[in-house]
Structures are given as structure tokens and as C-alpha cells.
């Protein structure tokens, strides 16, 4: 197993409808044509697995039906989109990735984005 | 270094606006937040809201909502802070500061706003 | 919304005295979004501790965070002439995000 750098940016304010999107950049020393991605969140000292696909290089990401998560891939980036967020699901949202094939197998953690989710102010009462 | 610097000080009158603005070097500003805090004259400090340079959204304190407005030009690395309708309870020093995973810092040097008729 | 109270409002005491600042949340507050603030007469605010409990970089280890759900303090080992100042709390775990009142730690 060898290392490999990937950045990610450190802090993102989830939209008011609790999407999330942020790039996963990956440093690959080959040329990989298949690669794993999976979002790992951080809180409270716990880590839980949020979604992962694997991918050929030059396709989309394909994660599970039910997944939370879309993505697409560009060369060694990867835009991350995480929807259905809740201010409860406000923490350290980690990327890791593997590069699988050829050998040798590469894997790389980025630091973490922190993900701030607010959910909307409910509208008030109104008469009609 | 990790540096906020910010715009000096502004006298404005009632009614009127100011854009107060935070310039940031040492690191790389679309991958951080922008807070503003600010601090009337002995008193304590207020949580304005805070903008994720990343992608622009904004998240604002209940009670200024509609007043204010936060916004960042990343060709410059410099978030700004526009507060209207100012009432004399507006007079203070506005601060902005880095916002990380889990912290404000640095902190920019502050700017005084000071509403006088 | 989550309110901070700190006490006490101010302490008085004498260089190379321990400090216990206090910081009661209204509601639980998860411990990776208390943070700790320092400021002096005429300065910006500067970070000591974050996550309850983990010093900022440069910040000497006479300075250390505690605490979980409601309840945090700020410890101050042996008072410094430099450590007289206003401190405050800050969570940021949930919106709106809020400040103490702060506490004032002035020389007795």
C-alpha cells in the first residue's frame, strides 16, 4: 500500500436546501483507470462510513440507488455533492481514495471538509 | 502568516450604509469561512454571521437578517461586510476572523463604525 | 438557540494563582464546537482553545480546556502578569452561533 496526497477543502457552509459540494482532489503518481472514492464523516471521535463508489477513469460515479451522495469526475478530481443534510449532520466529511487498478494500490485521506448545516428558520403561521 | 486585514474606520450617519472589508493572505482563502463579529463600546462580543468562501453561501444572526450582507471577491481573497438601516446601537468595532473546522483565528485587527447624526 | 453564561463575571486574583472560568450552555453542545477566547484592552480577540479542550498553536500550557454537554471550563494553571483579560466562550455547533458574556480576570 502507498501513500498519496488529497486535498479538500477545509470548510463548507451546506446550502439552505442542505446540499453539499466540494472537490476531492487526488495527487495519482500512474496512470489509474480504476479508482474507489468513499466519504467518511467525523463526530464526536466517531467515523461512520456516508457513501463510496468505485469508477473507471473517463465515466461517472456510480454510487448506490439510496445513496446521499452524486458525483463526477474530471482527471484527478472528484466533485462531491452530499444532499439531504440536516443541521444534525453538521461534521468532518472525509475523502478517501484508492486507486485499484493497475497496481500498486495507492490510498489517500484528505484532511477533512467541515460541513455546517443550518436548516431553514420554519416559515410562520399564516392565515388565508 | 495567516493575516486579516481590515479596511480603517468609518463615521456614518443614521439611515445610512457601510461596507466594511477583510482582506486575507498566508493561505488559501476559498478553502476556509469568513466570520464577523462585533463589540459595542464595554461590551462584549455579538456573532454577526459568516460566509463560506468555498461557495459563497451565507449564514446570518436572526436579528440582522435583512440588514446585512456578506460577500467575498476571490480574485482578491477579501470578504466584505455591509450593514444598512445603521442606528446608533450600531456603533462598534466589526471584527472579522477565520472561520476553521472547529475555530475563529486569526482575527482581523477590527474596524470601528461609529453612527452619529 | 443556545445561550452561554460564564462565571463568574470577575475574578480577582494575584499573579501565580489558578484560574477556573466557567461556561454553562443552555442546551448540550457537542465538545469539537466550544471554543475558548482571550482579549485584551484594544485588541482583537485571540484563540486559545477549541474543540473544549485543544490548544491553539503558540498558546502556553498553563492554559487548558475541560468539560462536555452544558457544562466547560477554562483553567489558567498559574496566573501570568500577561493573562489578565477578558475571556469568553464561543459555540459554534449549532446556528445561531453565540459568545458568553465573558469573564474579566483582573489583578487583585
Known amino acids: 500500500c502507498k501513500a498519496m496526497h488529497v486535498a479538500q477543502p477545509a470548510v463548507v457552509l451546506a446550502s439552505s436546501r442542505g446540499i453539499a459540494s466540494f472537490v476531492c482532489e487526488y495527487a495519482s503518481p500512474g496512470k489509474a483507470t480504476e479508482v474507489r472514492v468513499t466519504v467518511l464523516r467525523q463526530a464526536d471521535s466517531q467515523v461512520t462510513e456516508v457513501c463510496a463508489a468505485t469508477y473507471m477513469m473517463g465515466n461517472e460515479l456510480t454510487f448506490l440507488d439510496d445513496s446521499i451522495c452524486t458525483g463526477t469526475s474530471s482527471g484527478n478530481q472528484v466533485n462531491l455533492t452530499i444532499q439531504g443534510l440536516r443541521a444534525m449532520d453538521t461534521g468532518l466529511y472525509i475523502c478517501k481514495v484508492e486507486l485499484m487498478y493497475p497496481p500498486p494500490y495507492y490510498l489517500g485521506i484528505g484532511n477533512g471538509t467541515q460541513i455546517y448545516v443550518i436548516d431553514p428558520e420554519p416559515c410562520p403561521d399564516s392565515d388565508f | 502568516q495567516v493575516q486579516l486585514v481590515q479596511s480603517g474606520a468609518e463615521v456614518k450617519k443614521p439611515g445610512a450604509s457601510v461596507k466594511v472589508s477583510c482582506k486575507a493572505s498566508?493561505?488559501?482563502?476559498?478553502?476556509?469561512?469568513i466570520s464577523w463579529v462585533r463589540q459595542a463600546p464595554g461590551q462584549g462580543l455579538e456573532w454577526m454571521g459568516w460566509i463560506s468562501a468555498y461557495n459563497g453561501n451565507t449564514n446570518y444572526a436572526q436579528k440582522l437578517q435583512g440588514r446585512v450582507t456578506m460577500t467575498t471577491d476571490t480574485s482578491t481573497n477579501t470578504a466584505y461586510m455591509e450593514l444598512r438601516s445603521l442606528r446608533s446601537d450600531d456603533t462598534a468595532v466589526y471584527y472579522c476572523?477565520?472561520?476553521?473546522?472547529?475555530?475563529?483565528?486569526?482575527w482581523g485587527q477590527g474596524t470601528l463604525v461609529t453612527v452619529s447624526s | 438557540e443556545i445561550v452561554l453564561t460564564q462565571s463568574p463575571g470577575t475574578l480577582s486574583l494575584s499573579p501565580g494563582e489558578r484560574a477556573t472560568l466557567s461556561c454553562r450552555a443552555s442546551q448540550s453542545v457537542s465538545s469539537s464546537y466550544l471554543a475558548w477566547y482571550q482579549q485584551k484592552p484594544g485588541q482583537a480577540p485571540r484563540l486559545l482553545i477549541y474543540?473544549?479542550?485543544s490548544r491553539a498553536t503558540g498558546i502556553p500550557d498553563r492554559f487548558s480546556g475541560s468539560g462536555s454537554g452544558t457544562d466547560f471550563t477554562l483553567t489558567i494553571s498559574r496566573l501570568e502578569p500577561e493573562d489578565f483579560a477578558v475571556y469568553y466562550c464561543q459555540q459554534y455547533g449549532s446556528s445561531p452561533w453565540a459568545f458568553g458574556q465573558g469573564t474579566k480576570v483582573e489583578i487583585k
Open positions: 498566508g493561505y488559501t482563502f476559498t478553502s476556509y469561512g
Open positions: 474543540g473544549a479542550s
Open positions: 476572523a477565520r472561520v476553521g473546522a472547529n475555530w475563529f483565528d486569526p
